[in-house]
């Protein structure tokens, strides 16, 4: 778990004050209303591979 | 096993002062949000305040902003709840509780309570 | 701010019975729903949490449904035990978060 102002979340969480840890954005695309994912509004979404070519 | 034990309640006057703790013990106690929970003699469940693992996040209920303070001491793994300008209304069993999961999605460990009784 | 609303407020019921309690919230909260178990002048007990999961120690008796607003719980058999005060939780607003008013199952 990292402090803020060092090195970012990883692509697709955001920091989270509340937690002290980084939030993984995917779990607040059901919970948009929570403090939590407060950062992940802005946040890019998480990359996904495509299951086909 | 995991125990969380608060202390620190009683009788106290309308706009007096108290405060709470929560000690807890059988668990690594930093990493976890903590709240405090109150319930008034025969009523249910209120949330009063939220803190984050480091201390640094903290919430209230607003009928209690501005008046109650929540701080925790991870070396000593002790939970606080400052009470001030006490009101008859605050009259309630305070519980501390253990917010459970990644996201403090819900509380698994509680403590037993303390009764804050406010009257003159 | 969500409200949560269950009902009934009590219930009579006799060992042996399958039981059911309703929570409704006033928007939706997903699956972001917990129950909790409560006996007179004792703290609250953890039941089930974001919906359906059982939590660890609890009998299977208990179970939990619902997603959106409307949720359940449900004892499949009452036990001497099981005579309490039920409250659920909404977290889908984490931190800020509130309970139903209960629900008191007393002995018929």
């Known amino acids: 778990e990292q402090a803020p102002g060092t090195a970012p979340c990883s692509r697709g969480s955001s920091w989270s004050a509340d937690l002290d840890k980084c939030m993984d954005c995917a779990s607040c695309r059901a919970r948009p209303k929570s403090d939590f994912c407060l950062g992940c509004a802005a946040a890019p979404p998480a990359p996904f591979r495509l299951l086909w070519p | 096993e995991v125990q969380l034990l608060e202390s620190g309640g009683g009788l106290v006057q309308p706009g007096g002062s108290l405060r709470l703790s929560c000690a807890a013990s059988g668990f690594t106690f930093s990493p976890y949000p903590m709240i405090w929970v109150r319930q008034a003699p025969g009523k249910g469940l209120e949330w009063v305040s939220y803190?984050?693992?480091?201390?640094?996040?903290?919430h209230y209920a607003d009928s209690v902003k501005g008046r109650f303070t929540i701080s925790r001491d991870n070396s000593k793994n002790t939970l606080y709840l400052q009470m001030n300008s006490l009101r008859a209304e605050d009259t309630a069993v305070y519980y501390c509780?253990?917010?459970?999961?990644?996201?403090?999605?819900?509380?698994?460990?509680w403590g037993q309570g303390t009764l804050v009784t406010v009257s003159s | 701010d969500i409200q949560m609303t269950q009902s009934p407020s009590s219930l009579s019921a006799s060992v042996g019975d399958r039981v059911t309690i309703t929570c409704r919230a006033s928007q939706s909260i997903s699956g972001y729903l917990n129950w909790y178990q409560q006996k007179p002048g004792k703290a609250p007990k953890l039941l089930i949490y974001q919906a359906s999961s059982l939590q660890s120690g609890v009998p299977s008796r208990f179970s939990g449904s619902g997603s959106g607003t409307d949720f359940t719980l449900t004892i499949s058999s009452l036990q001497p035990e099981d005579f309490a005060t039920y409250y659920c939780q909404q977290s889908y607003t984490s931190p800020f978060i509130t309970f139903g008013q209960g629900t008191k199952v007393e002995i018929k």
């Open positions: 509780a253990r917010g459970g999961d990644t996201y403090f999605d819900y509380f698994d460990y």
């Open positions: 803190i984050s693992p480091s201390g640094g996040s903290t």
